[in-house]
Interface confidence: medium
């Protein structure tokens, strides 16, 4: 995730780890993988020294991924002291909020919303209907709840994975003349 121009928590009274982690994967950055399932998993956040929840896509990723909070703590958290304050990190926003708008390659034209890290606001864009990334919300409200307001549990994220019906621009895609024009 990009970290420019974002609000940060202050760095105060940070102690270094007592020792190197037993498992090197504890220091790996969270990786949700390229697939698009919606699976709750836990990872060890090297910045906060805590086990945290994330949504795993269901394939690939890395070893910093645990089925339970307890397993994560057992493997990683015991090697680190509790921190009196958190290290600098982006407050509450999922990583994908900092991805650029990505219409994908397809040529359906669907109104979606994305979080613009420059303006710090959710804005409308045209989504092509396939590929793209997770900074893609069906409603302005969902975008704001997830990315502008610091997120929380990320309710409604499942909707991101649901397909949206493609609506054609009037006249259809470029350089095609339709013999008949179809609207879903």
């Amino acid at each position: 995730a990009a970290e420019e121009d974002e609000e940060f928590t202050n760095i105060t009274d940070i102690k270094p780890p007592l020792q190197k982690p037993t498992h090197s994967f504890c220091a790996m950055k969270v990786d949700d993988g390229p697939c698009r399932a919606y699976i709750k998993r836990f990872f060890f956040n090297i910045l906060t020294h805590q086990c945290e929840e994330f949504i795993y896509g269901g394939c690939e990723g890395n070893e910093n991924r645990f089925e339970s909070l307890e397993e994560c703590k057992e493997k990683c958290a015991r090697d680190y002291p509790k921190m009196t304050t958190k290290l600098t990190f982006q407050k509450g926003k999922p990583d994908f909020c900092f991805l650029e708008e990505d219409p994908g390659i397809c040529r359906g034209y669907i109104t979606r919303y994305f979080y613009n890290n420059q303006s710090k606001q959710c804005e409308r864009f045209k989504y092509g209907g396939c590929l793209g990334n997770l900074n893609n919300f069906e409603s302005l409200e969902e975008c704001k709840n997830t990315c502008e307001n610091g997120g929380g549990s990320g309710g409604g994220l499942n909707d991101i994975f649901e397909a949206q019906k493609i609506e054609w621009h009037e006249g259809g895609p470029p350089h095609h003349h339709h013999h008949h024009h179809h609207h879903h």
């Epitope: 697939c35 698009r36 396939c130 590929l131 397909a163 054609w168 879903h184």
Partner: antibody, heavy 118, light 113 residues
């Protein structure tokens, strides 16, 4: 008239590299996403990779992720596919195609054959 | 194995109507993603026949039509002609994979006689 002409195919040993090119004409190249689709001898079609019109977004099939890199030079109206760590199963005719309508590829090149064999 | 399932082969006599099926799942056709159809004549590149479920690009005869319902799609060819002998592929998008554009395995259509 839209034309897509692939080049760069040939025989390469397993583990080797090749760079395919696709020269485009007859349409505003930078306005269109482009894809590579391949077809193994006697087999069906398989999507390989895609790139947005600006080149800012790229996408790959799992089978080539980490080994192939798609790119484009809009000033030259040319699409590229850099293929590294080639395997026997990458042997195929590679087509470039433009994403015109919806999720469709509406114009295709004639294809270039890549053979990976020792 | 292909994500979309098509019959490997079909045949029909000239003038007949044939239908090629394409069966998907809840993560592609059933998720309301559009289906495309391509025709590949022997030794040539694929050609777009139908896009957006039932739209024909200019130049494609109206003998070709497409439809999609639920997790299935079909391509209908009426008034079958000798030059329709080719491989036909359905294609869509699958959200359960790594953002993959997916194809059916192809159907070899033979025009009898």
């Amino acid at each position: 008239e839209v034309q897509l002409v692939e080049s760069g195919g040939g025989l390469v040993q397993p583990g080797g590299s090749l760079r395919l090119s696709c020269a485009a004409s007859g349409f505003t190249f930078s306005s269109y996403a482009m894809s590579w689709v391949r077809q193994a001898p006697g087999k069906g079609l398989e999507w390989v990779s895609a790139i947005s019109g600006s080149g800012g977004s790229t996408y790959y099939a799992d089978s080539v992720k980490g080994r192939f890199t798609i790119s484009r030079d809009n000033s030259k109206n040319t699409l590229y596919l850099q293929m590294n760590s080639l395997r026997a199963e990458d042997t195929a005719v590679y087509y470039c195609a433009n994403n015109g309508a919806a999720a469709a590829w509406d114009y295709w090149g004639q294809g270039t054959l890549v053979t990976v064999s020792s | 194995q292909s994500v979309l399932t098509q019959p490997p082969s079909l045949s029909g006599a000239p003038g007949q109507r044939v239908t090629i099926s394409c069966t998907g799942s809840s993560s592609n056709l059933g998720a309301d993603y559009d289906v495309q159809w391509y025709q590949q004549l022997p030794g040539t590149a694929p050609k777009l026949l139908i896009f957006g479920n039932n739209n024909r690009p200019s130049g494609v005869p109206d003998r070709f039509s497409g439809s999609r319902s639920g997790t299935s799609a079909s391509l209908a060819i009426t008034g079958l002609q000798a030059e329709d002998e080719a491989n036909y592929y359905c294609q869509s998008y699958d959200r359960s994979l790594s953002g993959s554009m997916v194809f059916g395995g192809g159907t070899k259509l033979t025009v009898l006689g």
